[in-house]
Each structure stands twice: as structure tokens, then as C-alpha cells.
């Protein structure tokens, strides 16, 4: 799939920070999403998980950004990249994990999908 360029990753990180900064209230009314393995292919997996959250304006930009990182079209209920579906977590926790890992990848220059 397409490799997210450094600038695109920076923009994703910045948006994830925007969503979470100083945030204590549950995101998306406390909606739960499938946890994902933070490995290669995580952007598609993240999108497949988050796309099932509807009516949450806070994460719409993140959903659009992730769709640009994923080589195939993703629709709600699709789980081709979501290898493990055994744990659901709050959207806020999911975003925080995604942010932490994306920053880790960025720091190490591994901007793979």
C-alpha cells in the first residue's frame, strides 16, 4: 500500500493531539471500538475499527486521514485488516494508543503502512 509521507504522518499526529489535548470527557459519547494490533497494516485496521463510529465529529478528520493511508476502500462492518476482534476499548483510549504508536514510528523513521 501507499507509504504515508512524513508530512502526512505529522498531520495525523497533530490531529490526534488536537482531539486528546486536555480532554477528560469521553470521546464520541464513550463509544467502544475494536482494539487493534499496532503493527504493519495498522492504518487500515485503525480505519476499519473507527469507521464503525458514526455521528462523532471529533474523529471525522482522523477517519479521512486514515482513509488516505489505506490502499483499499473501507466501509463499516468490514474487518479484513482487523486480525483480532476480542477486545473493545473506548474511542479515547484507542486514539491515545494510535497517537503513541504513530509518534514512535515517526521518531524511528518507519513510515510504513
Amino acid at each position: 500500500g501507499p507509504v504515508p509521507p512524513s508530512t502526512a504522518l505529522r498531520e495525523l499526529i497533530e490531529e490526534l493531539v488536537n482531539i486528546t489535548q486536555n480532554q477528560k470527557a469521553p470521546l464520541c459519547n464513550g463509544s467502544m471500538v475494536w482494539s487493534i494490533n499496532l503493527t504493519a497494516g495498522m492504518y487500515c485496521a485503525a480505519l476499519e475499527s473507527l469507521i464503525n463510529v458514526s455521528g462523532c465529529s471529533a474523529i471525522e478528520k482522523t477517519q479521512r486521514m486514515l482513509s488516505g493511508f489505506c490502499p483499499h476502500k473501507v466501509s463499516a462492518g468490514q474487518f479484513s485488516s482487523l486480525h483480532v476482534r476480542d477486545t473493545k476499548i473506548e474511542v479515547a483510549h484507542f486514539i491515545t494508543k494510535l497517537l503513541s504508536y504513530t509518534k514512535q514510528l515517526f521518531r524511528h523513521g518507519q513510515q510504513f503502512n
Epitope: R10, E14, V17, N18, Q21, N22, Q23, K24, L99, K103
Partner: antibody
Framework: EVQLVESGGGLVKPGGSLRLSCAAS????????MSWVRQAPGKGLEWVGR??????????NYAAPVKGRFTISRDDSKNTLYLQMNSLKTEDTAVYYC?????????????????WGQGTTVTVSS | SYELTQPPSVSVSPGQTARITCSGD??????AYWYQQKSGQAPVLVIY???KRPSGIPERFSGSSSGTMATLTISGAQVEDEADYYC???????????FGGGTKLTVLG
């Protein structure tokens, strides 16, 4: 030792400019979100603005009274934060503090850690 | 612009419990932070993220939050706690910081 040391304050005429510096040591400055806070004589604390770490986008935000006149920047290679103040007004007279930004502590490596400089005095008077 | 409102002053006798409040419309979703400032000194963080206490801060300092109000509680206030206390938070975007007007705590010795 974890510390911040401000410099560059002084007396300046209305309409003039001044650049404040804040030298950081003892922590990973590049990971830190940094703020400028000021305190006018006998008044309360006023948030001036903040700059995120570069990895978090390097976004800079300003308080309404200084937007368009003040510019915050950072040089991670020198562990230094700057505040460029232009078009100064008498109401900008204050002690200026640099500090780690607690909102950014969650993203940096200084969770719950609190670092402030000793402050540098800026006096705007004709 | 967004504002945080604090009472200008609070007075207690030594050993009593002091409560300082901070109200703001965004506080249900944004964390509050509390700073202590003694005369001529830089502020010191005493509570972060509503309820957490930094290392080195005495256990008598605690924080809570409910709805649009955050509260700093000093259980068994001591003379050395006499200072100005400021709440700090952000607007709903999280992008702009704001301090409350400050509360002067007097511990009547």
C-alpha cells in the same frame, strides 16, 4: 538539575520590541510543550501562549491580547525557548515566566513535573 | 474569550479545611490544574488533571471536579500554605490556556 532560566527583560518604550529567551536544562526539552505566562505588577497570572513539541506538530497558540504582536519560537538544538515581543504597550509591563506546559505533559516525558523559570521583568514606559 | 472564575479571597484558621473553587463552562470536559504562588516567587503546581498531586506536594492538598466547578481542598491548612492560588485550564478546543483570577488564602495565625 531541572531548570529554566529567562533573560532579555528590560525597559522599552511603547511601540518598541524585545526578545526574551528561556534556557532549559535537566529534561528533554524537545519533547516538552512550553508556555509563556506573565504577571503584571500586583495582578494575577496571565497565559501568553504555548508552543507544542515538534513531534506534536509544533503548533503555536496565543492569547488574544498578544496575538499578532508576539511570536513564540523554539530551538531544540539549543534547548531554548523565545518570545519576540513587538509593538509593545504599557499594559505589557509584567514579569514574564517560561514554563513547561501541563497540557502537553501527557504527551512529553514530564508527566506531573512542573518547571518554571524565575521570571524576567519587562517594563514598557515612555 | 473563555474565563475561569475564582473567589478573590478565602480565610481559615490553622488546622481548618480550606476550599477554593474555580468555575468554567469547559471544565466538564477539560482538566483543571492548580498553582500556588507565594509572594515574590514563581508559581508551583500543586494539583494536575483535576485530582493528581505532583511528588513533593503534601497530602493535605487535594483536588476534585464536578460539572463546571473544580475545587482545591487543603485539609488542615497550615500557616505556610498562605499564598495566592490559581486554577488553570483550557478553552473547549484545548488550544488556549487560561488562568483564574486567583484566590488569596489567608491562614489566620
Amino acid at each position: 538539575e531541572v531548570q529554566l532560566v529567562e533573560s532579555g527583560g528590560g525597559l522599552v518604550k511603547p511601540g518598541g520590541s524585545l526578545r526574551l529567551s528561556c534556557a532549559a536544562s535537566g529534561f528533554t526539552f524537545s519533547n516538552a510543550w512550553m508556555s509563556w505566562v506573565r504577571q503584571a505588577p500586583g495582578k494575577g497570572l496571565e497565559w501568553v501562549g504555548r508552543i507544542r513539541s515538534k513531534i506534536d506538530g509544533g503548533t503555536i497558540n496565543y492569547a488574544a491580547p498578544v496575538k499578532g504582536r508576539f511570536t513564540i519560537s523554539r530551538d531544540d538544538s539549543k534547548n531554548t525557548l523565545y518570545l519576540q515581543m513587538n509593538s509593545l504597550k504599557t499594559e505589557d509591563t509584567a514579569v514574564y515566566y517560561c514554563a513547561t506546559d501541563q497540557v502537553g505533559a501527557y504527551y512529553g516525558d514530564y508527566y506531573g513535573m512542573d518547571v518554571w523559570g524565575q521570571g524576567t521583568t519587562v517594563t514598557v514606559s515612555s | 474569550s473563555y474565563e475561569l472564575t475564582q473567589p478573590p479571597s478565602v480565610s481559615v484558621s490553622p488546622g481548618q479545611t480550606a476550599r477554593i473553587t474555580c468555575s468554567g463552562d469547559a471544565l466538564p470536559e477539560k482538566y483543571a490544574y492548580w498553582y500556588q504562588q507565594k509572594s515574590g516567587q514563581a508559581p508551583v503546581l500543586v494539583i494536575y488533571e483535576d485530582t493528581k498531586r505532583p511528588s513533593g506536594i503534601p497530602e493535605r492538598f487535594s483536588g476534585s471536579s464536578s460539572g463546571t466547578m473544580a475545587t482545591l481542598t487543603i485539609s488542615g491548612a497550615q500557616v505556610e500554605d498562605e499564598a495566592d492560588y490559581y486554577c488553570y485550564s483550557t478553552d473547549s478546543s484545548g488550544n488556549h490556556g487560561v488562568f483564574g483570577g486567583g484566590t488569596k488564602l489567608t491562614v489566620l495565625g
